[in-house]
Every structure is written in C-alpha cells, then in structure tokens.
C-alpha cells in the first residue's frame, strides 16, 4: 500500500507519554544482558529477575504508550540517558547501545528510523 | 561512478504543471532513498520531498503538499516530480539527490547530487 | 526564516580554525542525525558530514563535526582560500516530518 505521511505529531507528547512509562524493566534488561549474571550490578537487585521476565515488563511497559511506534526514538533515548552514568567504559557504552537497538525488534516493534542513540551531550 | 541528471525544467506561467525527470546511473537505484531539494535565487537550499526505495513513503514540505508528487521507475532508474498550480515561490534550481537514510538508526544525507535544472514560475 | 539557525557569515585567516553552529530544537537536532554540506559558488552542494561525525571518504579530515544536545558545530582547521563557501546544516524534523537546513553560512578566507 502506497501512503504519504502527514504529520506524525509532536515531540512533545512523546516525551510526556515516555515519562510516564516505567523504563527500569527496559534498563534492568539491558543491563543482564550486558553483564551476564555478574553479581557487581546489583543496584536494582536484577538478580532477582530472570532476564526473559525483564524484557516481557520492558515490552508491556512500552506498549503503554499511546503510540508505541512513533515514541519509540525518545524512550530509547531517555534509556540512553538514565543508564549513561553506570556505563564504565567505551566498550560497556557500545554494548549497551547495541541491545538497545535490538530492543524494539524484541518487543516486536519496527526500529525507529533517524534516532540518534548520542543523546548524553558527549558523556556516553 | 555515480550520475543523477535533471530535466524538465522551463519557464512557466503562474498556476501551470510541469514535471522533472532524473536519470540515475552507477548505483543500484532501488536500493537508495531519493529526494528533490530546491534553492530560489541568491536564497539557501530547501528541502522538497523524499520517497522511500520501494515509493511506498513519501514525505513532502508543507508548502508543496497537495500539489507536488514525487515518484520513481525502478526499472528504469528514473526519479520524478509532478509540479501542478506553480507559483512564483516556486522559482528556482531543482536538485535530485541521492538520500543515504537507512531503515534504522540513521539520518537523512545527501552524498550525491544532481547539476540541478531551472524552473521559472513567471507571467 | 528557517527553524535551523546558522550564523550569516563568519570570516578568518588561511591556516586558522573556524567553526559555524547550527541551533535546533528536541524534535528536530535533539532527537535526529545533521549532515553538513558545502556549496562552492556556481556549483551543486556537496556532502561534508552525515550523522553528526562523519565523513564521506574523500573529505579531508580538516572537517569535523559535533553534536551536543540541540545544537551541531561543523569545524574547520587549516583553512585554505579554496574554502570559500556557503556552509548548510540539515537533520530531520519529526514533528514537521520534514528534512530542515539551516539558512547557510558564508565563509571568508581572509
């Protein structure tokens, strides 16, 4: 099917929709799955929750919002943003952003198109 | 080597249709995002309208909505504009680009460039 | 008047560094990649830098590119009189759904 796209609505809506969703559960499984099951990353005690059970809360979390699809870009951004400080070297930086990106494929979502994932101003 | 070749462009009165064609060649022109970028005289460059490889997107600046349409031919590698009710805003050097945007994670660039073709909007 | 705002002109010497800035907002420079071109008077623009640091090959590496939250720099080193040009910032707007440039930068090489 042929269609030309009006406009997809404002940012600003998106941002409100992702503050309102829980992200930790999207962040925890990042991070499992960065870590390993290594014990050193217990500020949210993930050990807790196995890693399967992290993604199914990550991918209910974002089908909360009103448009999953197109507010895909920001809550992977806020995700980038939360996580940037625990992230201890280049290589943890690339890792993280690697899953990050798989995420919405994961939760059966299309990827978001130009979402530029280098939204901590230098610090990640 | 990469060629993207305009044509099409003329003087026309205000409120007339004309439609501008690119022939693309030394890339694989299904596989890219293909756009028309413009710039009236002595002003800076204005973005028109993208299409997506396979046509099934299209994205347009609000000015020409309604009454441009971008299209392409696959097969024969060709990029179009249909351009109907001109107006004098209309003026200026059209440029087919080649939009290097992938599916994820990426932006909108332009790395190849048309010689670009004049169109006049005057009475 | 465009929603990407460039300096109208800077100016410097051949060998020093410029740098021209490009200032958005989150839905568009926020949240998107900026690629910057060069436009040579009489000619089609040309690619210098896509998502946000790169270069096309053949772009010498005396052209660099930044972004820090909503707004980009394109940086210049070694400056030659051959860099005479209008610079033009772009990313897209996803509220506009709309590709934006900036309104151009003319640079002088003194």
């Known amino acids: 099917m042929r269609r030309e796209r009006g406009r997809q609505g404002d940012s600003s809506s998106c941002e409100r929709q992702v503050d309102r969703v829980n992200l930790k559960p999207c962040e925890q499984h990042i991070m499992q799955r960065i870590m390993g099951e290594q014990e050193q990353y217990d500020s949210y005690d993930i050990r807790s929750t196995r890693s399967s059970d992290q993604q199914q809360r990550c991918c209910d979390e974002l089908n909360e919002m009103e448009n999953t699809q197109r507010c895909m870009c920001e809550a992977l951004q806020q995700i980038m943003e939360n996580q940037c400080d625990r992230l201890q070297d280049r290589q943890m930086v690339q890792q993280f952003k690697r899953e990050l990106m798989n995420l919405p494929q994961q939760c059966n979502f299309r990827a978001p198109q130009r979402c530029d994932l280098d939204v901590s101003g230098g610090r990640c | 080597e990469v060629q993207l070749v305009e044509s099409g462009g003329a003087l026309v009165q205000p409120g007339g249709s004309l439609r501008l064609s690119c022939a693309a060649s030394?890339?694989?022109?299904?596989?890219?995002?293909m756009t028309w970028i413009r710039q009236a005289p002595g002003k800076g460059l204005e973005w028109v309208a993208n299409?997506?490889?396979?046509?099934?997107?299209?994205d347009y600046l609000d000015s020409v909505r309604g009454r441009f349409n971008i299209s392409r031919d696959n097969a024969k590698s060709v990029l179009y504009l249909q351009m109907n009710t001109l107006s004098a805003d209309d003026t200026g050097v059209y440029y087919c680009?080649?939009?290097?945007?992938?599916?994820?994670?990426?932006?909108?660039?332009?790395?190849?460039w048309g010689q670009g073709i004049l169109v006049t909007v005057s009475s | 008047q465009s929603v990407l705002t460039q300096p109208p002109s800077v100016s410097a010497a051949p060998g020093q560094k410029v740098t021209i800035s490009c200032s958005g907002t989150?839905?568009?420079?926020?949240?998107?990649?900026v690629s910057w071109y060069q436009q040579l008077p009489g000619t089609a623009p040309k690619l210098l830098i896509y998502?946000?640091?790169k270069r096309p090959s053949g772009i010498p590496d005396r052209f660099s590119g930044s972004k820090s939250g909503t707004s980009a720099t394109l940086g210049i080193t070694g400056l030659q009189t051959g860099d005479e040009a209008d610079y033009y910032c772009?990313?897209?707007?996803?509220?506009?759904?709309?590709?934006?440039f900036g309104g151009g930068t003319k640079l002088t090489v003194l």
């Open positions: 998502d946000n640091t």
């Open positions: 299409i997506k490889q396979d046509g099934s997107e299209k």
């Open positions: 772009a990313t897209w707007d996803a509220d506009l759904s709309a590709v934006l």
């Open positions: 680009t080649r939009n290097g945007l992938q599916d994820s994670y990426s932006g909108d660039f332009f790395d190849h």
């Open positions: 989150g839905s568009n420079i926020g949240h998107n990649y």
């Open positions: 030394g890339f694989k022109f299904s596989t890219f995002y």
